[in-house]
């Protein structure tokens, strides 16, 4: 009897999550009579995985038919492996006893490691938009992978970034791990069409890394530049003044015309034109009836972009001093000033 050995030939087995694990075990003798049990872990807290004698183990099947004579193969197959199944498994021979069977001999153990794919990286940017020349932070998270070794890279429009910090948790042994990385990105006016990419490489991905993306269009705000110009007289006593709103993003924009500080008209940008870089241009015009004014007129184009404090640009219309007679020409000169 003392000659019986329990052989677990595989020191370690690595299995992809979702697959089956085969844990091999053979006895070298039919003696003593008694069942085999499989445990995960050793000592008093060990977890019963399979008991030949009794119990219900829906995920476990024996590789060979234990009822067949001369059977000494006690290998098991565990189905639908998850990272929680990782650990060292022991094949233990019990000797028939009365009333209870007695542990006789254990195998050396097989360490089961589970290869689990990382989840798709999720990239998130700042809660509020930022303007060019500002530095913003992006985070990338991926979870549930095993083993712990993982590589994370950041790219902006295909160019690798270097200013980032990455942590893999937990630090100690675990059934699975998570990665968290924060990258700093300096915005430019051309970034409306830009993308930030977080790329995760892991042994389970067979050289085909997972990517998470964030569009800088969700993050950037490009404030408009304003230009107010006076057009040639369209009709007697009327001057056409335009406000060119250029290179802004996002589109949300409200423009108000003021005549000598009084609101003349408010409108919302609608039929904008898009520039190659993704920013927008818009133009608003105002017809000013010069004959209605005795004094010079200060016209102001005031723009509120994306909920930010208004910016404005003013234009002075000089009204001639001579009396206004019907049909007479009115000279109007302009001087421009920027107000914010």
């Amino acid at each position: 009897e003392e000659g019986l050995q329990v052989i677990q030939p595989d020191k370690s087995v690595s299995v992809a999550a979702g697959e089956s694990a085969i844990l091999h075990c053979t006895a070298t003798s039919l003696i003593p009579v008694g069942p085999i049990q499989w445990f995960r872990g050793a000592g008093p807290g060990r977890e019963l995985i399979y008991n030949q004698k009794e119990g219900h183990f829906p995920r476990v099947t024996t590789v060979s038919d234990l009822t067949k004579r001369n059977n000494m193969d006690f290998s098991i197959r565990i189905g639908n492996i998850t990272p929680a199944d990782a650990g060292t498994y022991y094949c233990v021979k019990f000797r028939k006893g009365s009333p209870d069977d007695v542990e006789f001999k254990s195998g050396a153990g097989t360490e089961l490691s589970v290869r689990a794919k990382p989840s798709a990286p999720v990239v998130s940017g700042p809660a509020a938009r930022a303007t060019p020349q500002h530095t913003v932070s992006f985070t990338c998270e991926s979870h549930g992978f095993s083993p712990r070794d993982i590589t994370l890279k950041w790219f902006k429009n295909g160019n690798e970034l270097s200013d980032f910090q990455t942590n893999v948790d937990p630090v100690g042994e675990s059934v699975s791990y998570s990665i968290h990385s924060t990258a700093k990105v300096v915005l430019t006016r051309e970034d409306v069409h830009s993308q930030v990419i977080c790329e995760v490489a892991h042994v389970t991905l067979q050289g085909d890394p997972l990517r998470g993306t964030a569009n800088l269009s969700e993050t950037i705000r490009v404030p408009p530049t304003l230009e107010v110009t006076q057009q040639p007289v369209r009709a007697e006593n009327q001057v056409n003044v335009t406000c060119q709103v250029r290179k802004f993003y996002p589109q949300r924009l409200q423009l108000t015309w003021l005549e000598n500080g009084n609101v003349s008209r408010t409108e919302t940008a609608s039929t904008v034109t898009e520039n190659k870089d993704g920013t927008y241009n818009w133009m608003s015009w105002l017809l000013v009836n010069v004959s209605a004014h005795r004094d010079d007129v200060k016209l102001t184009c005031q723009v509120e972009h994306d909920g930010q404090p208004a910016v404005s640009k003013s234009h002075d219309l000089k009204v001639s001093a001579h009396p206004k007679e019907q049909g007479s020409n009115t000279a109007a000169e302009n001087t421009g000033s920027n107000e914010r």
Partner: antibody, heavy 119, light 110 residues
């Protein structure tokens, strides 16, 4: 603890059939063979047949091959032995026994069922 | 078929003395490195009880005064010092092929 509980005594007429049951507990029924053995009054042990409840594989003693049928009901962990065309010399205690080592041996026994065949 | 023949048919031994029961197979019961012989004890009104398996291995809870030996075709069950509770009929059984039993040996106290 392994237990094999057999059905009660039967009295049958010659030519009739008898079906003896053996309800197993304390172990996984499908993992071990069940043997059937009989013992006529004052006589020795005679092996009848064996069944593997996991797949209903059976082996019969040639003497009983045409008259005995072994079956199992895994939902109730019960083994059955039916013997047909009974004769007076079939009067015996019928035992079920479980083979704990897959050695074609009999480790745990039921208490037996007395079948009396008499006209 | 392999036939097992036990000898003697009955045996009377004094308490504390050695009892020896023999079992001869009509052909070798050795296979795969094992001798496929089993010994059972049956007391009146009780089912048999396994004593020895694979010729020489005591079953769980069997007193060590019981021992089995032999190989091939000739096997022996020995009770080194007979006790009163050992009075019973003893059977050998083989499973080299499908099982068969010997005819039994009745052991009594002299």
């Amino acid at each position: 603890q392994v237990q094999l509980v057999q059905s009660g005594a039967e009295v049958k007429k010659p030519g009739a059939s008898v079906k003896v049951s053996c309800k197993a507990s304390g172990y996984t029924f499908t993992n071990y063979w069940i043997n059937w053995v009989r013992q006529a009054p004052g006589q020795g042990l005679e092996w009848i047949a064996m069944i593997d409840p996991s797949d209903s594989e059976t082996h019969y003693n040639q003497i009983f091959k045409d008259r005995a049928t072994l079956t199992t009901d895994t939902s109730t962990s019960t083994a059955y032995m039916e013997l047909r065309s009974l004769r007076s010399d079939d009067t015996a205690v019928y035992y079920c026994a479980m083979d704990y080592g897959s050695l074609y041996a009999m480790d745990y026994w039921g208490r037996g069922t007395l079948v009396t065949v008499s006209s | 078929d392999i036939v097992l023949t036990q000898s003697p048919d009955s045996l009377a031994v004094s308490l504390g003395e050695r009892a020896t029961i023999n079992c001869r197979a009509s052909q070798s019961v050795r296979s795969s490195g094992y001798n496929w012989i089993f010994w059972y004890q049956q007391k009146p009104g009780q089912p048999p009880k396994l004593l020895i398996y694979l010729a020489s291995n005591r079953d769980s809870g069997v007193p060590d005064r019981f021992s089995g030996s032999g190989s091939g075709t000739d096997f022996t069950l020995t009770i080194s010092s007979l006790q009163a509770e050992d009075v019973a009929v003893y059977y050998c059984q083989h499973s080299r092929e499908l099982p068969t039993f010997g005819q039994g040996t009745k052991l009594e106290i002299k």
